[in-house]
């Protein structure tokens, strides 16, 4: 007689990352009997929702359900029907929705309300949609990468199962770049965290962690570009903006109303004698870099040391995983290799930005022109943010690892979020009490 395979005793969870520029749905899977073990949860699917971020649906909230359908359908296909009702679904919205909430709490609530109603229509165990704080976003990103890197495991291994792994249990810092915000999170070396807002205390798997985190709202790559444009148009002599952050020959008309739509440009807002202006690319890395630096106020610091805008930042410590747009942009530019020095990255950026727009379009036919046109800015911004914003140096650059996935799971806040909300990170070594959600807030 043939042996029949026993049914797999597994569980699933779904997290939707409602970012400023798009929404992604992640499906996670783990063995039911090993819930409290470290490193057992893995991603089985990512479905990127076609279209913009949910905050863009503010004028047509009734269509959010249509927008989410394909990926929710995908989740129905991937997860066995018998598991649907017990599969939790969480939606976390990040900086795009934080910005919308700053403009209108009522509109942000309306968007979330429709999201909740839409997701409640599916056969899963919907657990709610909320705007997560920047602090949570940083913390969960840090938990995700360290969980996936096996840093919370107490067992010392003589072999390495994941890339970037050193046998020590020292955690990695987390660098996350989105469209509307950026987060930096790490365990400083014997350093007091001088501002309470930036301090997190965790007890995970029997070990205490004192973690520094900060989320810079408006310093995601898309909002940083809007800031830069709003700053630069102030001093333009007419409706032509010669911009070093775009390729030579690139032209784009921008509506002033679009420029001032976001709260991130309010500090630069002024009455202009025109309703539109034209960006004309000149493709000069050095000038682009200089223009970006003007977005970082480094003249004021009420602490022993700061990142920028008066925000405390302890001395950098250890290795860092740089993910989300840090990774996507650097991957596109072919600059994610561990062997590429900071000087080499700068050199490559100089060459890339100087390439004519027509040449770039021909070389990258399959890339959406809006995204393609912004890689020069984004790459330069990443260098500026890491070097001048966070004070990485040519030497410490080698401690930055640009990470897309670890063990098949995307680096980002979603896995950490789910692990926490499903109580899968115990405070003590298993078996003991799970970490309470309040630890993070």
């Amino acid at each position: 007689t043939q042996n029949k395979a026993l049914p797999e005793n597994v569980k699933y969870g779904i997290v939707l990352d409602a970012g400023s520029s798009h929404t992604s749905l992640y499906i996670y899977k783990w063995p039911a009997e090993k819930e409290n073990d470290t490193g057992v949860v893995h991603q089985v699917e990512e479905c990127r929702v076609k279209g913009p971020g949910i905050s863009k649906f503010v004028q047509k909230v009734n269509e959010i359900g249509i927008y989410l359908t394909d990926c929710m359908e995908r989740a129905r296909e991937v997860i066995p029907r018998s598991q649907h009702q017990e599969t939790p679904v969480y939606l976390g919205a990040t900086a795009g929705m934080r910005l919308l909430r700053m403009e209108s709490e009522e509109l942000a609530d309306r968007v979330l309300d429709v999201v909740e109603r839409s997701l409640s229509n599916y056969p899963f165990d919907f657990q709610g949609a909320r705007i997560i704080t920047g602090q949570e976003e940083g913390a969960y990103g840090w938990i995700t990468i360290n969980y996936l890197l096996g840093k919370f495991s107490q067992k010392t291994r003589w072999f390495s199962i994941v890339p970037y792994e050193t046998n020590n249990q020292e955690t990695f810092g987390a660098l996350d770049l989105g469209g509307a915000s950026t987060q930096v999170t790490f365990v400083p070396q014997n350093q007091t965290i001088e501002s309470p807002d930036n301090a997190l205390q965790f007890r995970l798997y029997g070990k205490d962690y004192n973690v520094y985190t900060h989320s810079f709202l408006c310093y995601g790559k898309d909002q940083a570009l809007w800031q830069k444009l709003a700053k630069d148009i102030q001093v333009a002599s007419n409706e032509i903006l010669r911009d070093p952050c775009f390729h030579p020959g690139y032209k784009k008309v921008v509506n002033v109303s679009d420029l001032y739509k976001t709260p991130c440009t309010k500090r630069f807002e002024m009455t202009l004698p025109f309703q539109q202006f034209e960006i004309q690319g000149i493709g000069n890395y050095q000038q682009c870099h200089q223009s970006i630096l003007e977005l970082f106020n480094t003249s004021y610091c009420p602490y022993s040391q700061c990142a920028f805008n008066g925000i405390f930042l302890p001395p950098l410590q250890g290795d860092f995983g740089a993910f989300s747009a840090f990774y996507f942009v650097m991957k596109f530019l072919n600059l994610t290799s561990e062997k590429v020095s900071q000087e080499k990255v700068t050199e490559m950026m100089k060459k890339f930005c100087a390439q004519p727009w027509e040449e770039i379009k021909t070389s990258y036919a399959g890339v959406k022109e809006k995204y393609l046109s912004e890689y020069c800015f984004s790459g330069t911004y990443i260098l500026s943010l890491l070097l001048q914003g966070y004070h990485f140096t040519a030497d410490s650059w080698e401690h930055i690892h640009f990470i897309g996935k670890i063990q098949g799971s995307d680096a980002g806040w979603t896995l950490g979020y789910m692990l926490n909300l499903t109580n899968m990170i115990p405070a003590e070594q298993p078996l003991s009490t799970p970490l309470s959600h309040s630890t993070y807030v």
Partner: antibody, heavy 121, light 111 residues
């Protein structure tokens, strides 16, 4: 500014195969689904299938499954419909189409000009 | 497969008049609180054009005179005041489940 350009008309023999292409410009096919729809001469529209170029998941009308294949090459920003074991009743204009939400949450649709496939001995 | 039946098969209307086309599905095309019914317009020798998606939402650049309504199995496309360029063939399509199916079409002719 967005254009879908389909390959030229094809005259093929019964039982043969043909591969139609749909090249997009001004838009990345990864950002939406590519649908294929056909229309026999003087008849109505018939949905063939679709592909998500971002992850190559495809869906078909079951009656075409096995005979028709949809693929995409995101580096070329092009989708393909391969027709095999062709029969005279497959004679039709084959359209590729994109529809979905753009960056401003407007619902767009773009269509190719169509490729006439004639199956005849 | 979900079968869509359009009525009438053809319709003669004068410019400026109102035109109504119906589409009936063999089973409900509603799911998750959404009606997965789309409407397309096709002129001779041209590719189709999306007019209405999800029963009642207008496609980009579609004139306001085109509207869609209905849920479950019964849907309607209404053109409030016909313009000369509106004379064409109109198709309904369900996208609730694969295979996405079209109605047989309604030919709108000038009276």
């Amino acid at each position: 500014q967005v254009q879908l350009v389909q390959s030229g008309a094809e005259l093929v023999k019964p039982g043969a195969s043909v591969k139609l292409s749909c090249a997009a410009s001004g838009f990345s096919i990864k950002d939406t689904y590519v649908h294929w729809v056909r229309q026999a001469p003087g008849k109505g529209l018939e949905w063939v299938g679709k592909i998500d170029p971002a992850n190559v998941n495809t869906k078909f009308d079951p009656k075409f499954q096995g005979r028709f294949t949809i693929t995409a090459d995101t580096s070329k920003n092009t989708a393909y419909l391969q027709l095999s074991s062709l029969r005279s009743e497959d004679t039709a204009v084959y359209y590729c189409a994109l529809y979905g939400y753009d960056d401003d949450a407007y619902y767009f649709d773009y269509w190719g000009q169509g490729t006439l496939v004639t199956v005849s001995s | 497969d979900i079968v869509l039946t359009q009525s009438p098969a053809s319709l003669s209307v004068s410019p400026g008049d109102r035109a109504t086309i119906s589409c009936r599905a063999s089973e409900s095309v509603d799911n998750y609180g959404i009606s997965f019914m789309n409407w397309f317009q096709q002129k001779p020798g041209q590719a189709p054009k999306l007019l209405i998606y999800a029963a009642s939402n207008q496609g980009s650049g579609v004139p306001a005179r085109f509207s869609g309504s209905g849920s479950g199995t019964d849907f309607t496309l209404t053109i409030s005041s016909l313009e000369p360029e509106d004379f064409a063939v109109y198709y309904c399509q369900q996208s609730k489940e694969v295979p996405y199916t079209f109605g047989q079409g309604t030919k709108l002719e000038i009276k």
